[in-house]
Interface confidence: low
Amino acid sequence: NLSQDDSQPWTSDETVVAGGTVVLKCQVKDHEDSSLQWSNPAQQTLYFGEKRALRDNRIQLVSSTPHELSISISNVALADEGEYTCSIFTMPVRTAKSLVTVLGIPQKPIITGYKSSLREKETATLNCQSSGSKPAAQLTWRKGDQELHGDQTRIQEDPNGKTFTVSSSVSFQVTREDDGANIVCSVNHESLKGADRSTSQRIEVLYTPTAMIRPEPAHPREGQKLLLHCEGRGNPVPQQYVWVKEGSEPPLKMTQESALIFPFLNKSDSGTYGCTATSNMGSYTAYFTLNVNDPSPVPSSSSTYH
């Protein structure tokens, strides 16, 4: 059986986020009347027992007993990374190493490349970049709640030689459903501890108009007032509405925004009505067939695409 060396100090490796605080704890079972000491990767003594050896206000004594020496380093910088040594000056000197790893926090991503006023079926290409991560972060894309598959994250070393800049691009064909959608680039990194660090770009998609005719009331009778609403959609929203009646001289006069009004419905109003909604992206005509019967029956109506 190997006998345990009770005078051998022990410690542990630590990981800390840049700007955070790390505690280095060194313990020993049998101190043999000797003091514990902490030194940094440059072999500068930080504390010998409870005595401060290095003038750095970031380094504070947490605990000093014959069996333990604990110190804290606040506002940790990337330059603080490395092997810290705990020593006890017995015969012979015994040491324990603590590897301190400093994580670089990725900056909020920046999205570039957005081209405004995309038209339906054009391809949008966006670029995302985040600097300052260590180790290199990962970038992910999404459109609303839907994941987008960008290209593989590219990694480039920052000028400081310690952190990394990561970048990724995504391309997709836009549809009218994408108008007003938020394209989000998120950075994933262990230093964030699950917190969301993302940037979004709202996109605008121009698309041709569509229209639909809606009667008000839904079931008008002879003698009633009827409004035929022409409801246009599109980006830009249709600004011009023209009503025609098949077999009549065009156009009919609108009296209320995009609606056609019948103050007093007659059987002679029966027929097929067309509403053309126009924007600078194009035109769309919706049709509505109105059958005006006696005061009791319900008119049959339909609307057709052209």
């Epitope: 009218r176 459903e177 639909m212 809606r214 839904a218 079931h219 959609r233 008119p299």
Partner: nanobody, 124 residues
Framework: QVQLVESGGGLVQPGGSLRLSCAAS????????RGWFRQAPGKEREFVAA????????NYADSAKGRFTISRDNSKNTVYLQMNSLRAEDTAVYYC?????????????????WGQGTLVTVSS
């Protein structure tokens, strides 16, 4: 849990007929519009027909006009699509959809609830 279940699809010869049904559960759909869309292999989903909450107003795509008829039976919470004079280009998965408002809509973004679809194959 909102559910739309389509049925009635299948294999039919050109010139034949099919009647698709769309049954709704999980919400009172009788007060809402309903639409049929279809998606052929390798193509985008396209509008076929829509019907308003009362059944008084219907809309058809050009490709469906004169051949397809949309109707509804609110007592059964069901909407139908009667398809006549079917052609090979009508082959697609047909989807039933319902919006979260009364107003019928003519493109997919106006609909919030979708069925799983039923396959219609027109072939000799």
């Amino acid at each position: 849990q909102v559910q739309l279940v389509e049925s009635g699809g299948g294999l039919v010869q050109p010139g034949g007929s099919l009647r698709l049904s769309c049954a709704a559960s999980g919400r009172t759909f009788s007060n809402y519009a309903r639409g049929w869309f279809r998606q052929a292999p390798g193509k985008e989903r396209e509008f076929v027909a829509a019907i308003d909450y009362s059944g008084g107003s219907t809309n058809y795509a050009d490709s469906a006009k004169g051949r397809f008829t949309i109707s509804r039976d609110n007592s059964k919470n069901t909407v139908y699509l009667q398809m006549n004079s079917l052609r090979a280009e009508d082959t697609a998965v047909y989807y039933c959809a319902a919006p979260a408002s009364r107003r019928p809509s003519w493109d997919a973004d106006g609909y919030d609830y979708w069925g799983q679809g039923t396959l219609v194959t027109v072939s000799s």
